[in-house]
């Protein structure tokens, strides 16, 4: 069998809402993957499991099942959304994300994704992780790959 290539493209969009009373940030982050089947037979994308970390804390998880099949020598682009919550011991981020003296409220998130594919009863898992910048201050749609290269505000240490 030839390889099945998984390429994490980046954040497609991030939609933000707040709970003012709880000082909580809700971020719905949609990511894009390219999955390439280099084989001469079809493969099933059985599931995608993803999680998002902020400051080494898992803030969101998602799992998609029975997603699609990819034909021989074909590639499919798949979007998946991870709902995340920044709250409790990280509620200090609420003031940052809602600060009106800043235009762009970029935070660094660790995106982790595992794709499970099957073919002829054989199962294969491919994982990727990537740091991405996401604006927690407004709804943002990114050009693919753009969120890797954005500037993030560096607080004074």
């Amino acid at each position: 069998p030839r390889s099945i290539d998984v390429k994490y493209i980046g954040v497609k969009s991030a939609y933000v809402s707040y709970d003012v009373q709880k000082r909580t940030i809700y971020l719905n982050i949609t990511n894009t993957l390219n999955i390439t089947n280099n084989n001469y037979y079809s493969v099933e994308v059985e599931n995608i499991t993803a999680q998002v970390q902020f400051a080494k804390t898992v803030i969101g998880k998602a799992r998609l099942n029975n997603i699609t099949h990819i034909g021989p020598l074909d590639m499919k682009q798949i979007d998946y959304t991870v709902p995340t919550v920044i709250a409790e011991e990280m509620s200090y981020m609420y003031d940052f994300c809602t600060l009106i003296s800043i235009k762009v409220h970029n935070i660094v998130l660790m995106m982790q994704v595992t794709v499970t594919t099957t073919y002829f009863g054989h199962s294969e898992q491919i994982s990727q992780e990537r740091y991405q910048y996401v604006d927690c201050g407004r709804n943002t749609t990114y050009q693919l790959g753009q969120s890797e290269y954005l500037n993030v505000l560096q607080p004074q240490q």
Epitope: V20, D95, L99, I102, G137, L153, Q156
Partner: antibody, heavy 122, light 112 residues
Framework: EVQLQQSGAELMRPGASVKLSCTAS????????MYWVKQRPEQGLEWIGR????????EYAPKFQGKATMTADTSSNTAYLQLSSLTSEDTAVYYC???????????????WGQGTSVTVSS | DVLMTQIPLSLPVSLGDQASISCRSS???????????LEWYLKKPGQSPKLLID???NRFSGVPDRFSGSGSGTDFTLKISRVEAEDLGVYYC?????????FGGGTKLEIK
């Protein structure tokens, strides 16, 4: 240390112009909007406007449109307020301010300059 | 512009008393992100304004817990549970939701 340092007091003639400065230390002004506030003697606080130092885009309260001009120089980390056609009504203390992130925990700090006194007198 | 109206203009109190200052906006000051940027400042002569409360009720770091903010819509209140000598000065409400941002006219807290 995060702070805003404003230029010294000015005594000006009516009709003249004056340019006040506000120099930031401990943070980069291009990351923040910078604000200017006016307080006349025995009067309240008035919001003049805000500037985005990164691109120079400025927004003014209608009252100060044509009177005030905000600019910024990111290389010197300084914001400026120019007041034109001065009259006695412009006699006031002018403050620059912003709110910044001051540590790795993204905590915020309200930051004000010490104020610049402008006196317009013939 | 959003007009911010404060009541009263002057508030004479005895030390240890509770003080309450009202602020009313001419229109709702909910920002497009859902937050209400209603803030309270204390201004003392010869000093720069000091932020006490932001987003209606969020006490800023270092501000004593005798200060509390409340309200919604267009009506907001600042309460000082036990007035101390260092609390005297002029209090301003401020809205930072809609440009141009605007201050209230101020309330002078003074000794009775």
């Amino acid at each position: 240390e995060v702070q805003l340092q404003q230029s010294g007091a000015e005594l000006m003639r009516p009709g003249a112009s004056v340019k006040l400065s506000c120099t930031a230390s401990g943070f980069n002004i291009q990351d923040y909007y910078m604000y200017w506030v006016k307080q006349r003697p025995e009067q309240g606080l008035e919001w003049i406007g805000r500037i985005d130092p990164e691109d120079g885009d400025a927004e003014y309260a209608p009252k100060f449109q044509g009177k005030a001009t905000m600019t910024a120089d990111t290389s010197s980390n300084t914001a400026y307020l120019q007041l034109s056609s001065l009259t006695s009504e412009d006699t006031a203390v002018y403050y620059c301010s912003t709110r910044v992130i001051y540590d790795g925990y993204y905590r915020t700090m309200d930051c004000w300059g010490q104020g610049t006194s402008v006196t317009v007198s013939s | 512009d959003v007009l911010m109206t404060q009541i009263p203009l002057s508030l004479p109190v005895s030390l240890g008393d509770q003080a309450s200052i009202s602020c009313r906006s001419s229109q709702t000051i909910v920002h497009s992100n859902g937050n209400t940027y209603l803030e309270w400042y204390l201004k003392k002569p010869g000093q720069s304004p000091k932020l006490l409360i932001d987003k209606i009720s969020n006490r800023f770091s270092g501000v004593p817990d005798r200060f509390s903010g409340s309200g919604s819509g267009t009506d907001f209140t600042l309460k000082i549970s036990r007035v101390e000598a260092e609390d005297l000065g002029v209090y301003y409400c401020f809205q930072g939701s809609h440009v141009p941002y605007t201050f209230g006219g101020g309330t002078k807290l003074e000794i009775k």
